[in-house]
């Protein structure tokens, strides 16, 4: 999957939602490379080069990519629940200038849900679609044990018990 | 396959209860089972959904939330709880599944069922 | 509730002619939209869903076009068969999420 340019676009607050969401203005810039894949499942619109992600009232985009940061708070999984029920996963994050999108719009200090958990199967941090972290590019903050799961504060990943109510970000 | 049962003839201000009944799969899994009526002679109307995982969230039509109750009641078993039915509330009632992939779509509708007021 | 508007509400057509429907959200839902056919005493069929994605079975003649709030369906190549009323359908993926549908567009067939 190519990371496209994309340009980035404001998402006014929608009647349904006390969510407000704010525009980027796009100084963050992609290198040309190549993104984990993520599995089809995840994949919401149709992604061909001549197609342009186009993200709903609501929703902010950023690389081909469409975000929203929720203003109540839940636990990871009714977080989890959330986002699928809006055909969306909690939040991938691919790299450190993702990461700055996230924080720049979070405008709050607070812990942030992330679609990242310790699953006690793989004995391993794994994002939503299956993946693994890549340790080179993200430090987990906290122990790796059962009932742990990710929320992000200053750009920094900590972990957490999963039961606990943070805010959360979904993605598709 | 899907079928819709429970439609009859009903007095205005009365009450009914529709069910939508699953064959070859269970709701449970990650998309909606949902209710859409149809007036004799004219368009489809979005009333709502209700999602088959675990959360068994609801969402209604602005028109519909109050009088109009969507449930998951068994494993393949969801109904539709109607109160205070005017003549407007004439019409074929359908459920329908939408695809548990990552499109919005209603890939599965049952036959229909009259509701007359 | 996001509310869709379809034009026109009915379309007259020759065999072998093409028909555009226009249906237009009130706010941006994407792409994500579907189309569907229904004919008199039979259940909605899709046609088309992820706003230009054809659904398996549905011949290429249908083509979906569009995002944000404006979408369009072509028939192309009519057919005797194709004579029914067309549906668009917005999906909202909002805090309450919402599926309306478009008033309806019927394509007559001459």
């Known amino acids: 999957l190519l990371v496209s340019q994309g340009v980035l676009l404001k998402c006014q607050k929608g009647s349904c939602s006390n969510a407000t969401q704010y525009e980027d203005t796009g100084d963050l810039k992609v290198n040309n490379g190549t993104r984990r894949n993520i599995s089809n499942k995840d994949l919401c619109a149709s992604r061909s080069a001549d197609q342009t992600v186009l993200c709903q009232s609501e929703w902010l985009k950023y690389q081909g990519k469409c975000y929203w940061f929720s203003n109540e708070m839940k636990s990871w999984s009714d977080s989890y629940v959330y986002c699928l029920e809006r055909k969306s996963h909690l939040l991938i994050i691919h790299d450190q200038l993702e990461m700055a999108f996230i924080q720049k719009n979070l405008r709050q200090l607070n812990y942030v849900w992330i679609g990242l958990n310790f699953t006690s199967l793989k004995m391993t941090w794994t994002w939503v679609d299956g993946s693994p972290i890549d340790s080179k590019i993200f430090f987990i903050k906290g122990p790796a044990k059962e009932n742990s799961c990710a929320a992000i504060k200053e750009s920094k990943i900590f972990s957490e018990t999963c039961s606990s109510v943070f805010k959360w970000i979904c993605q598709y | 396959s899907l079928e819709e049962y429970g439609g009859d003839v009903v007095q205005p201000e009365g009450s009914l209860t529709l069910t939508c009944t699953a064959s070859g799969f269970s709701f449970s899994g990650n998309y909606w089972i949902c209710w859409v009526r149809q007036a004799p002679g004219k368009g489809l109307e979005w009333i709502g959904c209700?999602?088959?995982?675990?959360?068994?969230?609801t969402c209604y039509a602005t028109w519909a939330k109050g009088r109009f109750t969507i449930s998951k009641t068994l494993s393949t078993t969801v109904t539709l709880q109607m109160t205070s039915l005017t003549a407007t509330d004439t019409a074929t009632y359908f459920c329908a599944r939408d695809t548990g992939s990552g499109y919005w779509k209603y890939n599965i509708w049952g036959p229909g069922t009259l509701v007359t007021v | 509730d996001i509310v869709m508007t379809q034009t026109p509400a009915s379309v007259e057509a020759a065999v072998g002619g093409t028909v555009t429907i226009k249906c237009q959200a009130s706010q941006s839902i994407g792409r994500d939209l579907a189309w569907y056919q229904q004919k008199p005493g039979q259940p909605p069929k899709l046609l088309i869903y992820?706003?230009?994605i054809l659904e398996s079975g549905v011949p290429s003649r249908f083509k979906g076009n569009g995002s944000g709030t404006q979408f369009t369906l072509t028939i192309s190549d009519l057919e005797c068969a194709d004579a029914a009323t067309y549906y668009c359908q917005g999906a909202d993926r909002s805090s309450t999420p919402s599926w309306p549908f478009g008033g309806g567009t019927e394509v007559v067939v001459k």
């Open positions: 209700i999602y088959a995982g675990s959360s068994g969230s």
């Open positions: 992820g706003a230009s």
